[in-house]
């Protein structure tokens, strides 16, 4: 699976759309998790409604919201009020019992608003600190905040 890079501005919302084969994943809940290391676990952030037929209802954990359109085969994750600490590698997953199938790997990057800094050039990259963990920006090119991924077979 390729890793898709999504960038969002700090303080704004970032929407991720993971598409999948609706028939293959019929009856399966979806989850959004954060990969903690090379071989480490993917830590669950939020998952869709426990009752699959109600998966269209938004489920929230903190500032992260998930909802699944099971007919269209699209699970949408919204990271609200994006913060530097939200930067990281995530996965969209399809759950079957204790098994989790990776639908998409998503690298979230958080950009600071250059207008916040009067002396800024094209892109202001703040220093990392304890409270500003993910501010090291790896791509300065602008990318769509809303991206749909091709279906996963």
């Amino acid at each position: 699976l390729n890793t898709t890079v999504l960038q969002g501005m700090a303080g704004q919302s970032l929407r991720v759309s993971c598409t999948y084969d609706a028939l293959k994943h019929w009856g399966r809940r979806k989850a959004w998790c954060r990969q903690l290391g090379e071989e480490g676990p993917c830590q669950r952030v939020v998952s869709t409604h426990g009752v699959w037929l109600l998966a269209f209802l938004k489920k929230r954990n903190g500032s992260t919201v998930i909802a699944d359109d099971t007919l269209a085969g699209t699970v949408t994750i919204t990271l609200k009020n994006l913060q530097a600490g939200d930067a990281g590698l995530y996965q969209c997953q399809s759950l079957r019992g204790r098994e989790a199938e990776v639908l998409q790997k998503v690298l979230v990057e958080v950009l600071e608003d250059p207008l916040d800094d009067q002396d800024a050039g094209d892109l202001w990259v703040p220093e990392e600190s304890s409270s500003f963990e993910g501010a090291q920006v790896e791509h300065s090119t602008s990318r769509n905040q809303e991206t749909s991924f091709p279906p996963t077979s």
């Epitope: 090379e38 590698l89 090291q136």
Partner: antibody, heavy 122, light 104 residues
Framework: EVQLVESGGGLVQPKGSLKLSCAAS????????MNWVRQAPGKGLEWIAR??????????YYADSVKDRITCSRDDSENMFYLQLSSLKTEDTAMYYC?????????????WGTGTTVTVST | VLTQSPALMSASPGEKVTMTCSAS?????MYWYQQKPRSSPKPWIY???ILASGVPARFSGSGSGTSYSLTINNMEAEDAATYYC?????????FGGGTKLVIK
């Protein structure tokens, strides 16, 4: 700015020992794993040591080529990372780099220092 | 063990260049570094395919399992360097022997 600065290199006698230091700044040092990588003159890169973060119990890992002679440690309160190498051999002559990789939010992003040179010779 | 090939290659400006890195067992991701003489290695590609900050878009990385590659579309003189692959998946965190790319 995210930065790693190594020090402690120099000329050392064979069978002697050395202690290298790496000063980290600009990031949450205590949440990241830290590594030492070396490069002998005209040769390729060799990973030799790693220490993980406190949340991973400061687990250490060493390359077979040095495992009986090496200790790495860290001081999270001072943002310092250390390498101690004993029973030095001429083949330990190399540039030693401090590298951030692993643990932390941005575990996949490497940060390298500029290196410190160690020469083992009589 | 990571095996890089070729060990040495030359390319003309504008040429497409591909170098490979083969792992003796499956790894999760591959990392690539660029090193020029008398300089420390620079992170170049991480998580197999993501370009590090400041790396020109003519570079790309791909692969999975045991087979990985770095490609340069339209080689430029400044790309002449030695490129190392590395896996951080398991101990020992090995590097490949390097591919030295020279300009024709």
């Amino acid at each position: 700015e995210v930065q790693l600065v190594e020090s402690g290199g120099g000329l050392v006698q064979p069978k002697g020992s050395l202690k290298l230091s790496c000063a980290a700044s600009g990031f949450s040092f205590n949440t990241y794993a830290m590594n030492w990588v070396r490069q002998a003159p005209g040769k390729g890169l060799e990973w030799i040591a790693r220490i993980r973060s406190k949340s991973n119990n400061y687990a250490t890992y060493y390359a077979d080529s040095v495992k009986d002679r090496i200790t790495c440690s860290r001081d999270d309160s001072e943002n310092m990372f250390y390498l101690q190498l004993s029973s030095l051999k001429t083949e330990d002559t190399a540039m030693y780099y401090c590298v951030r990789h692993g643990d932390g939010n941005l575990w996949y992003i490497d940060v390298w220092g500029t290196g410190t040179t160690v020469t083992v010779s009589t | 063990v990571l095996t890089q090939s070729p060990a040495l290659m030359s390319a003309s400006p504008g040429e497409k260049v591909t170098m490979t890195c083969s792992a003796s067992s499956s790894v999760s991701y591959m990392y690539w570094y660029q090193q020029k003489p008398r300089s420390s290695p620079k992170p170049w590609i991480y998580l197999t395919s993501i370009l590090a900050s400041g790396v020109p878009a003519r570079f790309s990385g791909s692969g999975s399992g045991t087979s990985y590659s770095l490609t340069i579309n339209n080689m430029e003189a400044e790309d002449a360097a030695t490129y190392y692959c590395q896996q951080w998946s398991f101990n020992p965190y090995t590097f490949g022997g390097g591919t030295k790319l020279v300009i024709k």
